[in-house]
Every structure is written in C-alpha cells, then in structure tokens.
Amino acid sequence: HTAAQDNCTCPTNKMTVCSPDGPGGRCQCRALGSGMAVDCSTLTSKCLLLKARMSAPKNARTLVRPSEHALVDNDGLYDPDCDPEGRFKARQCNQTSVCWCVNSVGVRRTDKGDLSLRCDELVRTHHILIDLRHRPTAGAFNHSDLDAELRRLFRERYRLHPKFVAAVHYEQPTIQIELRQNTSQKAAGDVDIGDAAYYFERDIKGESLFQGRGGLDLRVRGEPLQVERTLIYYLDEIPPKFSMKRLTA
C-alpha cells in the first residue's frame, strides 16, 4: 500500500500533526497548540480547535426569539485553557491576569475579574440556536426539504445524533437551527452540540476543519444555499451572571 504518511492524516481535523509511530504503527495525531492526542474518528473539541487556531500562523413557522439569558460570542478568539479531556476549563485568564468564567462552548458567562475570580463548575450549554440568513434566491426554499437537508448535514458531516437537532425553522431569508443536548442525554461517544455548531460555523465561513474534504456545498433540491450572515446564541443550563451594568448597556 502507499506510504504511511499518505494514510496517516486526521480526516476530522486538519489542524493536527500526525505520524505512524503509535503502538503497532498506529497513526497518531496531535492537535497543534496543545499537542494533545485527538480521536480522528470524531469531531475534535472546540477548545482544542481554538487553541490550535491561536497557535497557527495566522415548529410553528415563527422564528425563535433568543431568551434574555442567551449568550452571543462577542469576545471572539482567545487562547483557551483546556482540561486533559480537551474541554474548556471553567475559568479562563489572559496574560494580564484578567479572568472570566466560560460555559462548555467556551463563551464568557460572567463579568471579567482578576485572579481571585472563582468558577466552581463548567456550566453546560444545553441549547444552541444557529441563526442564518441566506442570500436571495428565485423563491423560498421548501421548508421540509430544507429541514431534511440540514438534519442530514448534521447527521452525516458532523456525526451528531439526529435527536439533538431539535428543530429547523424557516422564514425567508432566515433559517434557524435549534440544537438541544442536556447533560443527562449525552452518552459516551456522542458528539457535543457545541463542537458540531463550531464545525458548522467554520464550514459556513468557508474555513472547513476537515482534512482534504471540499468546502461545504449546501444544496436544497439542487439549489445552492448560500449563507450571508450567521449568529449563534448559546443557552446554558444555569443562567449567566453578568452585572446589571452590562445588561442595561
């Protein structure tokens, strides 16, 4: 067969270094930035992907109204601390000793503080609302076709169990995908909704994380679905703790 290097790649994460030096010549891949071993048969955790990115050179048809507790990732990129399993550590700090608490998708859920800030537990994001606006098309997409295509995408491309895609809403030109996954629902081996949402977000932006796969080509009944705006809202099992000053800003 062909050279080991040709086979020894990580299909689900191109931000890795792989070599066939594992036990019995097994292909072993490590995430850039953290050097942590990754399982290439599934999605890599968002924490390790963010770390790698920072290290790299540079059903009613009504739409859902995000709740008052919904978080949007306004802080953007940062170099996160990940635990040995690749999950976000509950407390994140920058080089200037400014610290904050994050949820399981790494989004800040408290005001920023100093090193004395305590984050007792990693709060799970159990509901993700992906809000998309597609480019103008000749006509609206058929809602059931759109629903089926997006569910297929999350099942096949991101390996997310169908039960975690709670709903797909559509009011031209806005599409909303609801992902729900409680701690009790998530079994060992299940893809995390936060990781699936992150892969999807990167795909939509034309920055696919998959190795050597073409970019995302979303089509509904042959008609290209081109996204021009994406907003993602994160709802945690425990509401975030921000001061009133931020809430009224």
Epitope: P20, D21, P23, G24, R26
Partner: antibody
C-alpha cells in the same frame, strides 16, 4: 516490494551482547515503525520494542528496558536491535517487522543461541 | 499491561471444516487487534488487522470479528495450507502483547 533482510545466526556466551541488523528495502524507511519480536524455541511471540526512524522515537517492553537498545541508520535503511547481558533464556529467534496500523511485514528471523 | 488470552491452545480439524479461534483482552482495545499465521521455521504472516480488515492477498475464507474485549478469527473452510499456529496481537497501547497462540492440527 517490501523486504526486510536480517543478519545471520549468532552463538553468544552468557553475559555478552548481540546486535541483530534488519535491512529494509522496497519502501521509504522513515515512513514506518520497525518492531522487534522474539520467539524462544517452541514458545509464543514476545514483543520487545518499537522504533520510528522518522523521528527516532522508541518504546520498549519493560522486561527488556536497559538491556535492549533499538537504533536506526537512515543512510543505509537498516534497523538494529542490541541485547546485552545475555543469558541462556535469551536463546530465541529474533524478528524485525515493519508495522503500519497493525499490518506487518516480517524479516526472516535471526536465531541467537546463548550457550557457555 | 493488557493480557491477551487466546483459546483454544490447540485444535484438531479436517479439511473443509469451519474453524473459530478466540482472543480475549483484559481490557477494551478499541478494535486494535491483528491476527497472524505462523508455520514451523517461518516468520509470522499478517492475516487481519483492525480486528476485521483482511490483508491484501489473504484468501477470503479468513475473517475477523469482535469488538471491545472479545475477538474471533474464523476460517470458513479449512484448507491443507491453513494448518499452522495462529496468534492475535493487541496494539491499542504499549507494550504490545500477543495471545499465547492456537495450533491448528490435522485430525
């Protein structure tokens, strides 16, 4: 095609050392690990260690740690296994094998006899 | 270290028989298991890797199955050239460990 040719049989005295060579051809030497496995007369297979010539990383079976030394010469595409402080129970056929994902190509084996 | 328990240690069978050899790991090995055939005075030969993938050039009468800790090598119809000793190997973690071997003899 992939070939691993090992050095000839050796007879050694207890307490001495032996160095078995394994010359690889038919593939890029630095792309695959070489494992060393031994088999005592009438016994099963026993893993000794693994070397990856691509980065000179290696792993040893704890049983042979300190006595076995694995090396690889990239200029001649040859892997070596040296075993020191030989004793009679080290009498065995020593195999090198190129592994990838558990799939192995084996050398023909080298019989090492330890006898006073 | 992961212990690999292979059974039976020997078996007698006739040409055309269906033969099954099992290998049990002391802990889960994520399907990182391979099977080898060895004839007297010869080096082992790869048959199966990743628990169920047939090595190119190996006859299709050989098959591997199982997951977790329990694995099986099956020879669907034993041929004269199949009389040999068979070994399993786990390569989930270091140190690699072999099963004790199964000698398949002519009945």
């Amino acid at each position: 095609q992939v070939q691993l040719v090992q050095s000839g049989a050796e007879v050694k005295k207890p307490g001495s050392s032996v160095k078995v060579s394994c010359k690889a051809s038919g593939y890029r030497f630095t792309d695959y690990v070489i494992n060393w496995v031994r088999q005592a007369p009438g016994q099963g297979l026993e893993w000794m260690g693994q070397i990856y010539p691509g980065s000179d990383t290696f792993h040893y079976n704890q049983k042979f740690q300190g006595r076995a030394t694995l090396t690889a010469d990239k200029s001649t595409n040859t892997a070596y296994m040296e075993l020191s402080s030989l004793r009679s129970e080290d009498t065995a056929v020593y195999y090198c094998a190129r592994f990838f994902e558990g799939l192995a190509y084996w050398g023909q084996g080298t019989l090492v006899t330890v006898s006073s | 270290d992961i212990q690999m328990t292979q059974s039976p240690s020997s078996l007698s069978a006739s040409v055309g028989d269906r033969v099954t050899i099992t290998c049990k790991a002391s802990q889960g090995i994520n399907n990182y298991l391979s099977w080898y055939q060895q004839k007297p005075g010869k080096a082992p030969k790869s048959l199966i890797y990743r628990a169920n993938r047939l090595v190119s050039g190996v006859p299709s009468r050989f098959s591997g199955s199982g997951s977790g800790t329990d694995f099986t090598l099956t020879i669907s119809s034993l041929q004269p050239e199949d009389f040999a000793t068979y070994y399993c190997l786990q390569y989930d973690e270091f140190p690699l460990t072999f099963g004790g071997g199964t000698k398949v003899e002519i009945k």
